[in-house]
């Protein structure tokens, strides 16, 4: 056969040769020839390559900068990048998690629908009728209004989305 024009999986074409790619965790030192195999070297400390490749340089592991609220969630290897996450009370600003912002709080009248994680912000929802929230909080859900009837009391002041009902004693003259 003549020299190939296409190569198998995990190979690449160079100078009419099909050369083996370097495995994840290794970088290319020299291309194969008619007489020699591809030469690869392991990535150094704090470096990685996560695919079969012909890269001559390994990538640096991501740095989780504490000044940006970041910490290491999973330490990188020669084949994987470091995964960063945010400190408690903070979440990533993007999928790449390059910086963090403080979890937002839900204002009075709103409750927490979903508590924030290292990668997602707090999700708030308006307190529906029958529920209220009178605090700004990143954890508190909307609370149901107090049921005056179960306490043998009557509603003296109606509740809102921000305030509970005010219960009072029943008017005895109205027996």
């Amino acid at each position: 056969p003549e020299p190939p024009t296409a190569c198998r999986e995990k190979q690449y074409l160079i100078n009419s040769q099909c050369c083996s790619l370097c495995q994840p965790g290794q970088k290319l030192v020299s291309d194969c020839t008619e007489f020699t195999e591809t030469e690869c070297l392991p990535c150094g400390e704090s470096e990685f390559l996560d695919t079969w490749n012909r890269e001559t340089h390994c990538h640096q592991h991501k740095y989780c900068d504490p000044n940006l609220g970041l910490r290491v969630q999973q330490k990188g290897t020669s084949e994987t990048d470091t995964i960063c996450t945010c400190e408690e009370g903070w979440h990533c600003t993007s999928e790449a998690c390059e910086s963090c912002v403080l979890h937002r709080s839900c204002s009075p009248g709103f409750g927490v629908k979903q508590i924030a994680t290292g990668v997602s912000d707090t999700i708030c929802e308006p307190c529906p009728v029958g529920f209220f929230s009178n605090v700004s909080s990143a954890f508190e859900k909307c609370h149901p209004w107090t049921s005056c009837e179960t306490k043998d009391l009557v509603v003296q002041q109606a509740g809102t989305n921000k305030t509970d009902v005010v219960c009072g004693p029943q008017d005895r003259l109205r027996a």
């Epitope: 020299s30 020839t33 008619e34 007489f35 020699t36 195999e37």
Partner: antibody
């Protein structure tokens, strides 16, 4: 086109050192490939002696023990064979080669 | 070392005939990547060896398609489909999978 050319003395005395030069044109010896010395004895038997790689490291035929050294001069794009303590058994035609391209060969006789 | 045994030693042919040369290694020439570095060379009288086939079956540039290589592991074959006058000379196999590189003893292709 890649070309290789050997040069050196045609006659060496026993126990002396043989020193041959290979001049390469058309390709840098630091780019890739192994740059080999091969010899052909009377009767046509071929023997691989060793190589210097593009990165300057070596591999030698263990049969030549500690007699062989291959070095290079990268600015001149040349590599060299030094064979110590020669005997009449080292009489041969010496080729420098990348294996796909060969020099024309230089005949070396070991004799007093 | 990988000992390369070439047969026959001499191969008398008529022009236009098919010729077949065998090369057998004392150990497998397939490396851990699944590649086999077995080469065939022709040395015409008074000339340097020239590369015909590399990696078992790949024709080197400019080599006529009447030359073909095949085989795997330890057994390899060079075939010339229709011998021409310019094909006469000595054929060598060379393995470069293992160090030291080793040659077969050669097969002389000559006119009957």
């Amino acid at each position: 086109d890649v070309q290789l050319q050997e040069s050196g003395p045609g006659l060496v005395e026993p126990s002396q050192s043989l020193f041959l030069t290979c001049s390469v044109t058309g390709y840098s010896i630091t780019t890739n490939y192994n740059w080999n010395w091969i010899r052909q004895f009377p009767g046509n038997k071929l023997e691989w002696m060793g190589y210097i790689r593009h990165d300057g490291t070596n591999n030698y035929n263990p049969s030549l023990k500690n007699r062989i050294s291959i070095i290079r001069d990268t600015p001149k794009n040349q590599f060299f064979l030094k064979l110590n303590s020669v005997t009449t058994e080292d009489t041969a035609i010496y080729f420098c080669t990348r294996l796909d391209y060969w020099g024309q060969g230089t005949s070396v006789t070991v004799s007093s | 070392d990988a000992v390369m045994t070439q047969t026959p030693l001499s191969l008398p042919v008529s022009l236009g005939d098919q010729a077949s040369i065998s090369c057998r290694s004392s150990q497998s020439l397939e490396n851990s990547y699944g590649n086999t570095f077995l080469n065939w060379f022709l040395q015409r009288p008074g000339q340097s060896p020239q590369l015909l086939i590399y990696r078992v079956s790949n024709r080197f540039c400019g080599v006529p398609d009447r030359f073909s290589g095949s085989g795997s592991g330890t057994d390899f074959t060079l075939k010339i489909s229709r011998v021409e006058a310019e094909d006469l000379g000595i054929y060598f196999c060379l393995q470069v999978t293992h160090v030291p590189y080793t040659f077969g003893g050669g097969t002389k292709l000559e006119i009957k």
